[in-house]
């Protein structure tokens, strides 16, 4: 039985040209995390394998940094980065847990007033 839950940063906003940390946390389970995948709807951004380390997809290599921890840092944000991001926790023996984050990338002046999207 899967007892775990994923906490995420939820809906977040960031300024165009800036950077943002995508973070998920798996709790309420003793399952071993074997791998965390960071994905958009149709493509893989990065993988953090517990044993083998990080893999960053080539199309994101210049703009994605691994960490902190199992999180992912997106840099040099553009408006096209707006959308859903998923953290997929592969665990043993539970299976797969998925968390969702919605990122809105705003023009500089708008972002200053976009705090309502920020989850502390």
């Amino acid at each position: 039985m899967m007892t775990g839950t994923i906490e995420t940063t939820g809906n977040i906003s960031a300024e165009k040209g800036g950077s943002i940390i995508l973070q998920c946390h798996l709790s309420s389970t003793t399952a071993q995390v074997t791998q965390v995948n960071w994905e958009q709807q149709d493509q893989l951004l990065a993988i953090c394998n517990a044993d083998l380390g990080w893999h960053i997809s080539p199309s994101f290599k210049d703009r994605v940094a691994p960490g902190p921890g199992l999180g992912l840092t997106l840099q040099s944000l553009t408006v096209n980065d707006t959308g859903e991001y998923f953290c997929i926790y592969h665990t043993y023996p539970d299976g797969t847990y998925t968390g969702r984050i919605f990122l809105e990338v705003l023009e500089s002046s708008v972002a200053e007033h976009g705090a309502r999207f920020q989850i502390p």
Epitope: Q35, L52, G53, I56
Partner: antibody
């Protein structure tokens, strides 16, 4: 340039163990993950497992769990793969392969080591 | 484990022909697929990764595409040195798995 040089061919009896080495050069040893892939005669490629030289972390295919051990010697930039309880089906060419910085595709390959298991 | 099913298993072509090999994953692997070429008695060589980037030094006649579960590898104009066996591989999750291979032979 990146080079992976493997130890020579081995002939083993069923039930024995074999230890194959893969000496690397031409890059910073701890930057690339190293994997072992085997190929039985006339067959396809099969991933055995991988090791992260940075921390010694290993990931093995379930099929080989309990029979395979991968280790690193950072002083000589060498990776080892030991396979125990050998059977005839383990007869294959064993390759070490390196995946680049933040990558899992196998860009660098050793020349292969033929392991023959025969009574 | 994720199964990678490659087709066809063998293929005959003439120099100059366009050939296409397909690989189907048993589950969504996003864009985490690579293609290798192997000649008899030699180690495989990385050609295409993720799944449309050509590796350093790989000629432009080799290309790859796809996402999710369906992937395609194409040689736009087969050259004599291209007769070999080609493998797809997924690295979305361990254990990393390969297709069974496609042998490209001279017609």
């Amino acid at each position: 340039q990146v080079q992976l040089v493997q130890s020579g061919a081995e002939v083993k009896k069923p039930g024995a163990s074999v230890k194959v080495s893969c000496k690397t050069s031409g890059y910073t040893f701890t930057e690339y993950t190293l994997h072992w892939v085997r190929q039985a005669p006339g067959q396809g490629l099969e991933w055995i497992g991988g090791i992260n030289p940075n921390n010694g972390g290993t990931s093995y295919a379930q099929k080989f769990q309990g029979r395979v051990t991968m280790t690193v010697d950072t002083s000589t930039s060498t990776v080892y793969m030991e396979l125990s309880s050998l059977r005839s089906e383990d007869t294959a060419v064993y390759y070490c392969a390196g995946s680049g910085y933040y990558d899992y595709s196998f860009a660098y390959w050793g020349q292969g080591t033929l392991v023959t298991v025969s009574s | 484990d994720i199964q990678m099913t490659q087709s066809p298993s063998s293929l005959s072509a003439s120099v100059g022909d366009r050939v296409t090999i397909t690989c189907r994953a048993s589950q969504d692997v996003k864009n985490a697929v690579v293609w290798y070429q192997q000649k008899p008695g030699k180690a495989p060589k990385l050609l295409i990764y993720s799944p449309s980037y050509r590796y350093t030094g790989v000629p432009s006649r080799f290309s790859g595409s796809g996402s999710g579960t369906d992937f395609t590898f194409t040689i736009s104009s087969v050259q004599p040195e291209d007769f070999a066996t080609y493998y797809c591989q997924q690295h979305y999750s361990t254990p990393f798995t390969f297709g069974q291979g496609t042998k490209l032979e001279i017609k």
